[in-house]
């Protein structure tokens, strides 16, 4: 292993998964590396194998239990270590003392569906996945709509500052194909970040009614 600047970032999905990315400037040649999780007040520990995602970064998911089980709470502190094999020994490459509920990134919203569509309007709903009951209603959402001839990056962001799992899109163009995405973020946590965007939902507005000939 070659030494270099190292960055180790992890997020908790609020239930039973900690996802980690480790990047190192100096390339690691044919080295086996893992993330080890050691909670301060629990009897279990967990390991995952780091797999390359680019030339100098590796990722893995610590699966702590069944997807909807509440494996950690706000009082837990988990020491996360990157360990790389060096001959017969393991070398600690990075360490993070991790407060799960200060480092949240939820799963992307799922089950997007068109509830009702008109010529200029579309009502869309979705569900959140594997989100802790601790949040109650303390979640916010961002949504975006892809219009013809534009990119996702150009799409204006619509902010829903409450746990509202639906949206009514207005001022749409009749008989036009659109795509829609949504993401979620808990209000809690100093280092909490947005979930990934949902899978896009494609929909088409209804054509305008034809005017009568006189």
């Amino acid at each position: 292993a070659v030494n270099g600047t190292s960055q180790f970032t992890c997020f908790y999905n609020s239930r039973a998964n900690i996802s980690c990315v480790w990047s190192q400037d100096g390339a690691l040649q044919d080295t086996s590396c893992q993330v080890h999780a050691w909670p301060d007040r629990r009897r279990w520990n967990q390991t995952c194998e780091l797999l390359p995602v680019s030339q100098a970064s590796w990722a893995c998911n610590l699966i702590l239990g069944a997807p909807d089980s509440q494996k950690l709470t706000t009082v837990d502190i988990v020491t996360l270590r990157v360990l790389c094999r060096e001959g017969v020994r393991w070398r600690v490459m990075a360490i993070q003392d991790f407060k799960p509920f200060e480092n949240l990134r939820l799963m992307a919203p799922i089950s997007l569906q068109v509830v009702h569509v008109e010529t200029h309007r579309c009502n869309i709903s979705w569900e959140i996945s594997q989100a802790s009951h601790y949040f109650e209603r303390h979640l916010e959402f961002e949504a975006r709509t892809l219009s013809p001839g534009h990119t996702w990056e150009e799409a204006p962001l619509l902010t829903l500052k409450q746990k509202q799992e639906w949206i009514c899109l207005e001022t749409l163009t009749p008989d036009t194909q659109y795509e829609f995405q949504v993401r979620v973020k808990p209000l809690q946590g100093e280092f909490t970040t947005w979930s990934p965007w949902s899978q896009p939902l494609a929909f088409r507005t209804k054509p305008a009614a034809l005017g009568k000939d006189t």
């Epitope: 030494n3 190292s6 270590r81 060096e86 070398r91 600690v92 490459m93 990075a94 360490i95 993070q96 003392d97």
Partner: nanobody
Framework: QVQLQESGGGSVQAGGSLRLSCAAS????????MRWYRQAPGKEREFVSS???????VYADSVKGRFTISQDNAKSTLYLQMNSLKAEDTATYYC??????????????WGQGTQVTVSS
């Protein structure tokens, strides 16, 4: 060889303040996480706070907003400023240093502890 020596403990009334220090020697150029733990009589040792080489801090919920961890790299010293002390903060406080990164920078080291007594 890494050595850690705590100081600054003592007796104080509830609501008072103390500042603990932990002087570190050996392997001072290594990346490390430095932590404070505490152990009350008849209880398990518990995490209090930590600070990483990149200055990122973590606190146990029971001390957040009352305790502040810091370090002076020039003096190789770790500090724990403890304000608004409560009777339940009574414990022996231990400093810990965990080295990482280079192959010669590995290992976990503990100090001998310093006693903090808070009377109500």
């Amino acid at each position: 060889q890494v050595q850690l020596q705590e100081s600054g403990g003592g007796s104080v009334q509830a609501g008072g303040s103390l500042r603990l220090s932990c002087a570190a020697s050996g392997s001072t150029s290594c990346s490390s996480v430095m932590r404070w733990y505490r152990q009350a009589p008849g209880k398990e040792r518990e995490f209090v706070s930590s600070i990483n080489s990149d200055r990122r801090t973590v606190y146990a919920d029971s001390v957040k907003g009352r305790f502040t961890i810091s370090q002076d790299n020039a003096k190789s010293t770790l500090y724990l400023q403890m304000n608004s002390l409560k009777a339940e903060d009574t414990a022996t406080y231990y400093c810990q240093r965990e080295l990482y990164g280079d192959s010669w920078c590995q290992g976990n080291y503990w100090g001998q502890g310093t006693q903090v007594t808070v009377s109500s």
